[in-house]
């Protein structure tokens, strides 16, 4: 019998390399059975995850998964950092792994680096 626990499918140590000025959607895939849980996004500040209030969020429904989306319209340099989603389910809090946004400020980049160039940056490799 399949578990009816809520599960949040963000990979551990995942990241996204994005550009300031672009729109971006950060997705939290949520698996649940009967009732969709309340889901929130927070941004890590040291060991504390600060809840993101008043941000544009939305739900997207697919066959056996829902996605709670945090919208960046557009991405700002200050959006750089690690984010986590959490679900409130049966008065328990289920937390996802954190995922990191590496924001390149296009003003300081002469051209957009490739994925391999992004991966070659020491701050990316060892963060």
């Amino acid at each position: 019998k399949e578990s009816c626990d809520v599960q949040l499918y963000i990979k551990r140590q995942s990241y996204h390399s994005i550009f300031a000025g672009d729109p971006f959607k950060l997705e939290c895939p949520v698996k649940y059975c009967a009732h969709r849980p309340q889901v929130t996004w927070c941004k890590l500040n040291g060991t504390t995850c600060v809840k993101l209030e008043g941000r544009h969020t939305s739900w997207k429904q697919e066959k056996n998964l829902s996605f709670f989306i945090l919208h960046f319209e557009p991405v700002l340099p200050s959006d750089n950092g690690s984010y986590r989603c959490s679900a409130n389910f049966l008065s328990a809090i289920i937390e996802s792994h954190s995922t990191t946004l590496y924001v390149t400020d296009v003003k300081s980049a002469s051209e957009r680096p490739s994925k391999d160039e992004m991966a070659s940056r020491p701050w990316l490799l060892y963060s």
Partner: antibody
Framework: QVQLVQSGAEVKKPGSSVKVSCKAS????????MYWVRQAPGQGLEWIGR????????RYAQKFQGRATITADESTSTAYMELSSLRSEDTAVYYC????????????WGQGTLVTVSS | DIVMTQSPDSLAVSLGERATINCKSS???????????LNWLQQKPGQSPKRLIY???KLDSGVPDRFSGSGSGTDFTLTISSVQAEDLAVYYC?????????FGQGTKLEIK
């Protein structure tokens, strides 16, 4: 069950490149990380790097940065590791492995590919 | 990089006896999520490595329960409670907490 099948043994000249493939079955590779490790004859294990097949982002050990390129093709469930500027010290068995990106609930290794670098 | 140091480099154990392999990391493997990403691999002669234990003490499916893992922070142990002939192998610890991933040098288990 999850299985990995790697390409066959290769003999290469110093200075050339080699590209090893690793085909996964029994899993949606979008839900995994795929990584590469090598083992020189009679030696221990050395981590080369890993890729997130969901978005193509790769991370590398500093030693292999700029010389190794890891890619993945989601449509064929295949990961690739290309190593350039080969030297004799690169003679080793190259293993690919795959693990569950969410809960680490599985970790499966391929059979290995022997790459011999010799003039 | 995190340095993983195993001891001993090799050990010979009689069938049915206990074998203990130690692994020490140069810094704590406790991740920010509260978990410790320390794995143990077994590599039998002429074969690919196979994960036995993950998250310090969780056994992979199909792994006999004579294998167990323990430890925290920087000090970890793999124990085989009653060594069998098929346990002849090299055992590696490796960490999945920080990049780059790093392995211990391996411990060769021989049967007396």
């Amino acid at each position: 069950q999850v299985q990995l099948v790697q390409s066959g043994a290769e003999v290469k000249k110093p200075g050339s490149s080699v590209k090893v493939s690793c085909k996964a079955s029994g899993v949606n590779i979008k839900d995994t990380y795929m990584y590469w490790v090598r083992q020189a004859p009679g030696q221990g294990l050395e981590w080369i790097g890993r890729i997130d097949p969901a978005n193509g982002y790769a991370r590398y050990a500093q030693k292999f940065q700029g010389r190794a390129t890891i890619t993945a093709d989601e449509s064929t469930s295949t990961a690739y590791m290309e190593l350039s500027s080969l030297r004799s010290e690169d003679t080793a068995v190259y293993y690919c492995a795959v693990y569950d990106g969410y809960y680490e609930s599985f970790d499966v290794w391929g059979q290995g590919t022997l790459v011999t670098v010799s003039s | 990089d995190i340095v993983m140091t195993q001891s001993p480099d090799s050990l010979a154990v009689s069938l049915g006896e206990r074998a203990t392999i130690n692994c020490k990391s140069s810094q704590s493997l406790l991740d920010s999520d509260g978990k410790t990403y320390l794995n143990w691999l077994q590599q039998k002669p002429g074969q690919s490595p196979k994960r036995l234990i993950y998250l310090v003490s969780k056994l992979d499916s199909g792994v006999p329960d004579r294998f167990s893992g323990s430890g925290s922070g920087t000090d970890f142990t793999l124990t085989i409670s009653s060594v069998q002939a098929e346990d002849l192998a090299v055992y590696y610890c490796w960490q999945g907490t920080l990049f780059p991933r790093t392995f211990g040098q391996g411990t060769k288990l021989e049967i007396k």
